[in-house]
């Protein structure tokens, strides 16, 4: 029985050119995390394997950095990065847990209704 839950950073609105951190945390289970995949739509961004460490997809190498922890840092954001990101936790013996984060990247000039932008 899968008892775990995934907590995420929550949805994020950020400014073009900035950087953000996507993080998920698996709790309420003693299952062993064997691998965490980060995906956007149907694209694999990165893998963190318990034994083999990090692998960043070649097409994202310039703008994606591993960590902190099992999280992922996206740099030099573009409007095209807007979308839903998935953290997929492969665990034993529970199976797969998935978290979802929606990232909205706005043009630097957009400050509609006084929106606050985050650039850590």
């Amino acid at each position: 029985m899968m008892t775990g839950t995934i907590e995420t950073t929550g949805n994020i609105s950020a400014e073009k050119g900035g950087s953000i951190i996507l993080q998920c945390h698996l709790s309420s289970t003693t299952a062993q995390v064997t691998q965490v995949n980060w995906e956007q739509q149907d694209q694999l961004l990165a893998i963190c394997n318990a034994d083999l460490g990090w692998h960043i997809s070649p097409s994202f190498k310039d703008r994606v950095a591993p960590g902190p922890g099992l999280g992922l840092t996206l740099q030099s954001l573009t409007v095209n990065d807007t979308g839903e990101y998935f953290c997929i936790y492969h665990t034993y013996p529970d199976g797969t847990y998935t978290g979802r984060i929606f990232l909205e990247v706005l043009e630097s000039s957009v400050a509609e209704h006084g929106a606050r932008f985050q650039i850590p």
């Epitope: 907590e7 995420t8 950073t9 929550g10 949805n11 994020i12 609105s13 953000i20 951190i21 993080q23 739509q41 409007v79 095209n80 807007t82 979308g83 839903e84 979802r100 984060i101 929606f102 909205e104 706005l106 957009v110 509609e112 209704h113 929106a115 606050r116 932008f117 985050q118 850590p120």
Partner: antibody, heavy 119, light 112 residues
Framework: EVQLQQSGPELVKPGASMKISCKAS????????MNWVRQSHGKDLEWIGL????????SYNQKFKGKATITVDKASSTAYMDLLSLTSEDSAVYYC????????????WGQGTSVTVSS | DVVVTQTPLSLPVSFGDQVSISCRSS???????????LSWYLHKPGQSPQLLIY???NRFSGVPDRFSGSGSGTDFTLKISTIKPEDLGMYYC?????????FGGGTKLEIK
């Protein structure tokens, strides 16, 4: 003036599929997400999902995965929602609503499309 | 999914009254950057929902200043001072911090 014009009411048979349209005007269509929300008779509002016209990306409420498919036609500034394998439970008013940039809210809404599923 | 609970379900009022509607979420609506995505809507019979408040406390354009929003974390409030006839209808809060977005169950503002 921002306007979202939805297609008219529909009466469909159980098991059928249908498409609702939402034509946007008065703003840059690709600069804002488009959401879809439904209200079943006398029930709460439910967020179905959204689409990013700029890149075609989507996000769905898992409850509606396989039931709703959201697409856009950038050339005509129109968002569409396909509703599949309809049952009486899908009878509702469906709204499109523009996303409010930077706040994960919805600022302008279409007039709603009433869908009745009945044999 | 995040569960959003609104109270009361029904709120009988007289014109000129001041009222508060509460919205509580099953987990914090503040993201890792300190932003909270909680909005309020009014849905009148035969009309589309309309945005009143976004980002907890920001009034949308054209919304009268008798509407105000407050709160943090998991606890939020919409206050309406001096109720007018056009304020009657269903009020909904919406959390947009976590996927999927979820609405509260609604509060019906009606005449006593």
């Amino acid at each position: 003036e921002v306007q979202l014009q939805q297609s008219g009411p529909e009466l469909v048979k159980p098991g059928a599929s249908m498409k609702i349209s939402c034509k946007a005007s008065g703003y840059s269509f690709t600069g804002y997400t488009m959401n879809w929300v439904r209200q079943s008779h006398g029930k709460d509002l439910e967020w179905i999902g959204l689409i990013i016209p700029y890149n075609g990306g989507t996000s769905y409420n898992q409850k509606f995965k396989g039931k709703a498919t959201i697409t856009v036609d950038k050339a005509s500034s129109t968002a569409y929602m396909d509703l599949l394998s309809l049952t009486s439970e899908d009878s509702a008013v469906y709204y499109c609503a523009r996303g409010l940039r930077g706040y994960f809210a919805m600022d302008y809404w279409g007039q709603g499309t009433s869908v009745t599923v009945s044999s | 999914d995040v569960v959003v609970t609104q109270t009361p379900l029904s709120l009988p009022v007289s014109f000129g009254d001041q009222v508060s509607i509460s919205c509580r979420s099953s987990q914090s609506l503040t993201n890792s950057y300190g932003n909270t995505y909680l909005s309020w809507y009014l849905h009148k019979p035969g009309q589309s929902p309309q945005l009143l408040i976004y980002g907890i406390s920001n009034r949308f354009s054209g919304v009268p200043d008798r509407f105000s929003g407050s709160g943090s974390g998991t606890d939020f409030t919409l206050k309406i001072s001096t109720i007018k006839p056009e304020d009657l209808g269903m009020y909904y809060c919406l959390q947009g911090t976590h996927q999927p977005w979820t609405f509260g169950g609604g509060t019906k503002l009606e005449i006593k």
